[in-house]
Amino acid sequence: REPTVQCGSETGPSPEWMLQHDLIPGDLRDLRVEPVTTSVATGDYSILMNVSWVLRADASIRLLKATKICVTGKSNFQSYSCVRCNYTEAFQTQTRPSGGKWTFSYIGFPVELNTVYFIGAHNIPNANMNEDGPSMSVNFTSPGCLDHIMKYKKKCVKAGSLWDPNITACKKNEETVEVNFTTTPLGNRYMALIQHSTIIGFSQVFEPHQKKQTRASVVIPVTGDSEGATVQLTPYFPTCGSDCIRHKGTVVLCPQTGVPFPLDNNKSKPGGWLP
C-alpha cells in the first residue's frame, strides 16, 4: 500500500526531539502554499491553506515517520499553530510507483484577510537537541477584500466589497465640484475628498435613507483647480468603521445644462484600502 498522511494538531515539541538520532531523514524538496475555499454551514465560506510538500527522493525517506508543519500569522495579532502529519506506511520506494516524487498535502489552517503567514515544515525524526535540522519555510500573504475570491466573504460584503458607488464628479465652477454616487444600505455616512496632489476639498455626507439604494449628490467647495482631480469616497459602515473599502473617481468639466452627465469615463475605481 502507498503511504498517505494522517494529520493532527501538535503544538508542543515532538516527542522524537527528546531522543538521540544517529541519522535523520533528508530535508523536504519543496513546500508550497495556496488558498482554497470551503463552504461552511452559515452560508458563508472559509479560506483555508492548502500546504503541499514534496519529499526528497533518496533512501533517507525510509527513516521518515512524520512531517510537522507550523504556521505563524502576523496581522493585528499574532497566531501560531502546528500540525503533525504521520505517514501511514513505511516508504518502499523513493518515488511514487507511477513516477514522480512523493507529494502530500494538508488543508486545514484557516486564512484571515490581509495577513502575512510564515509556514515552516520539517521531517520527523528531527535534529537532535543541539543541532540544526533540515527544514523549509515559505511566506504566504493572504489577500484582502478586493481579491476576486475574498470579496464574496460575508465580512467583505459587509465592508462594501460588492458595492459599486458609480461615482461621477464634475467641476461646476472654479470654487465647487459636484459629486454624485449610489449609496448602500450597509451604512449612511460617507466622506468625499477631492485631491489634486493635496486635498483641495472635502465633505461629510449623511444619507438618512439607509435602507434603500439612492443616488446622493453633494457640492464640495474646493481651494484649487479641480479638473482631473481624484475623488475619494470613504464609507463608514458598522463592520469596518473608518477602514472600509474606498472608491475613486475623476473630476471632469460639468456638461452644459440639458446635456446628459458624462458617466463613461468616471467609473468607480477600487482603491488599495482593505479592511
Epitope: 544517529d22 527513516l63 520506494t93 523513493q94 511514487r96
Partner: antibody
Amino acid sequence: EVQLVQSGAEVKKPGASVKVSCKTSGYTFISYWMNWVRQAPGQGLEWMGRIDPYDSEIQYNQKFKDRVTLTRDTSISTAYMELSRLRSDDTAVYYCARSGGFDWFAYWGQGTLVTVSS
Amino acid sequence: DIQMTQSPSSLSASVGDRVTITCRTSENIYSNLAWYQQKPGKAPKLLLYDATNLGDGVPSRFSGSGSGTDYTLTISSLQPEDFATYYCQHFWGPPYTFGGGTKVEIK
C-alpha cells in the same frame, strides 16, 4: 523484459564532447531514476549522477558537475549523458543503470566505451 | 561523501569453498547497501540489495549480512561461474560510492 540499450563505442579527441544514449524498454520510463556509472580500464565503478525522467531533476557527483549533462526524452524512453572537455583520463566504459525501489542498480546497459586520444 | 572500504582486494579459492567478502562504510548507512558481480567485458549484475535481499534470479548460495557500518557478502559454495569481481555500493543518498572491488580467482 527490462532492457537498456546503449549507443556504440566512440573515439574522441581531448577537449571534445561525447553524448551517450540509453534506450529503455520493458518498464515505465518515468517511474525510475536513471543513473550513469563509469569504469576506467582495470579500475572500479564510479557514480556520475542520476536523472528522474518524470521531471528531469538531476543530481550530480560533484567531481563531474561542471562537465556532465544528463537529459532524457520521454517520448522515446531514452536517457542521455553528455561529457564535455574530454581528457585522456575520461577513457572508460560508461554505463546507464536503472534504479530499483531505491538506488540500487537493478538493470544495466551493456556499456559504451569512450576512448579519448589525440 | 561516504567512503567504502572493501576487503580483501583479491582472493584465490576453489570450487566448493565458502567465500566471504566484507565492506566497511565511513558512516552508518542503515543497511542501504547493494552487492554486484562483474565479469570481464560485461556490465555489473545486481546480487543483493538492502544488504540481505537477493536480486532477481540470483542463486541462494549468495547471501548478505551486516548493519550499521559493517557488511558481508558470503558465497556458501563457490561455483565455476562465480569467479568474477564483486563490488559493494551504498545508496544512502547521493553521491553513491562503490567499494574498490574484490577479485575472486581460481586457486
